[in-house]
């Protein structure tokens, strides 16, 4: 028996439903008695779902996996795992056991989108060419870890005096805060940029100072 | 026929670990779920874990997690569980059991383990 | 965890009765199992899938249910059955037991 899975990771995001697809071919006139299917974890072998001895033996993974039963005489050995967590992430084996054995590894890559970030100065108010501000751009929720990049109001990379911290929450969820320290010119505009690096998706932030007093740009 | 043959009878002391092996023979070892559980004496039966020889994938109980560890020797159709950290509550007939369909079918003989000091 | 309640604990009969002993899950389970054990040895599986019986299993011996709720009946009790009974759930992890009825003689 040879078994097929998808090479390229599985994308899912948090809270959404991911499908770990795999496959064999059965011979003419298989039986569903005959099938040993498990889904492990690669690492571990911690058992994840199996079907064996033409029984479904269910999920032994928090109560959120699930076979296409109807689809198992065909062939179609994939796993839908549900309500999708950061700590899913992983490889997982697929075992399809008939007379002989074969197996094959899934990775599942876990992401969820960053917020819109958030700006905020210090200080203020008052503010006055040659004062030095710190800008925090904060954005919530997210993963895996964001990369932020800084710009100034002509596109240029601002990269000096960057701090940028990024916490998990009890979901695994990173909590993104970068500050910026600089020193004001007559005005200007600086913008934060927070990007996932799995979904290629990325939020945005500015703040614009034109003296007094200071404006944040509508949301698009 | 299906016989399951387990390891003799153990007294170790607490904080010990013990290994105990149940021999398969009459049926093709790597195709079935072997399980092992538990009978304190006078009491009932408690599910420790399970494993597949032939992929090695395993589940535990969560009790028993952080002190068990089932494993299989495929050369000679043999099954181990070895339960680290013992106490006195871990005296008990240990059985090995062969899964049928979604039960346990066949039972090894059972091994009295005797946790003492 | 799926808890399973067998009851009665203890049941007195005498021999050639009919008796009928329960199971109750605490969630759905969609097939119960049913083992007998004799003092000092081994359980032996008795039905399967709720309703079938094992092997070399006497045909006195029955089971039904569905849900939380199941039975094993014994039509005609013989003297080898004065011994304790448990049932099974595989519908989840951790695959548990009852704590058992055990049968004696009245």
């Known amino acids: 028996v040879e078994v097929q899975v998808s090479e390229d990771p599985v994308v899912a995001l948090v809270d959404t439903d991911a499908t770990l697809r795999c496959s064999f071919s059965p011979e003419p006139g298989f039986s569903l008695a005959q099938l040993n299917l498990i889904w492990q974890l690669t690492d571990t072998k911690q058992l994840v779902h199996s079907f064996t001895e033409g029984r479904d033996q269910g999920s032994a993974y928090s109560n959120r996996t699930a076979l296409f039963p109807d689809l198992l005489v065909q062939g179609n050995a994939s796993l839908r795992l549900q309500r999708v967590r950061v700590t899913d992430e992983g490889s997982y084996t697929c075992f399809v056991s008939i007379q002989d054995f074969d197996s094959a590894a899934v990775s599942l890559q876990v992401a969820a989108p960053y917020s819109k970030p958030s700006m905020t100065l210090e200080p203020n108010k008052d503010l006055r060419p040659g004062n030095m501000v710190t800008i925090t751009c904060s954005s919530y929720q997210g993963y895996p870890e964001a990369e932020v990049f800084w710009k100034d109001g002509q596109g240029v990379p601002l990269t000096g005096n960057v701090t940028t911290s990024q916490m998990a929450n009890e979901r695994g969820l990173f909590d993104v805060h970068s500050v910026l320290r600089v020193v004001l010119g007559a005005n200007g505009t600086y913008s934060c940029l927070v990007r996932n690096p799995v979904l290629q998706q990325d939020a945005h932030g500015s703040v614009t100072i034109t003296g007094q007093p200071l404006t944040f740009p509508p949301e698009a | 026929q299906v016989q399951l043959v387990q390891s003799g009878a153990e007294v170790v002391k607490p904080g010990a670990s013990v290994k105990v092996s149940c021999k398969a023979s009459?049926?093709?070892?790597?195709?079935?779920?072997m399980h092992w559980v538990k009978q304190a004496p006078g009491q009932g039966l408690e599910w420790i874990g399970m494993i597949h020889p032939n992929s090695g994938a395993f589940n535990y109980n969560e009790r028993f997690k952080t002190r068990v560890t089932i494993t299989v020797d495929k050369s000679t159709s043999t099954a181990y569980m070895e339960l680290s950290s013992l106490r006195s509550e871990d005296t008990a007939v240990y059985y090995c059991?062969?899964?049928?369909?979604?039960?346990?079918?066949?039972w090894g003989q059972g091994t009295l383990l005797t946790v003492s000091s | 965890d799926i808890q399973l309640t067998q009851s009665p604990s203890f049941l007195s009969a005498s021999v050639g009765d009919r008796v009928t002993m329960t199971c109750s899950a605490s969630?759905?389970?969609?097939?119960m199992y049913w083992y007998q054990q004799k003092p000092g040895k081994s359980p032996k599986l008795l039905i399967y899938?709720?309703?079938n019986l094992a092997s070399g299993v006497p045909s006195r011996f029955s089971g039904s249910g569905s849900g939380t709720e199941y039975t094993l009946t014994i039509s005609s009790l013989q003297p080898e059955d004065f011994v304790t009974y448990y049932c099974q759930q595989w519908s989840s992890y951790p695959l548990t037991f009852g704590q058992g009825t055990k049968l004696e003689i009245k």
């Open positions: 899938d709720t309703s």
């Open positions: 059991a062969r899964s049928t369909a979604l039960a346990t079918g066949y």
């Open positions: 009459g049926y093709t070892f790597t195709n079935y779920w």
């Open positions: 969630s759905s389970v969609s097939y």
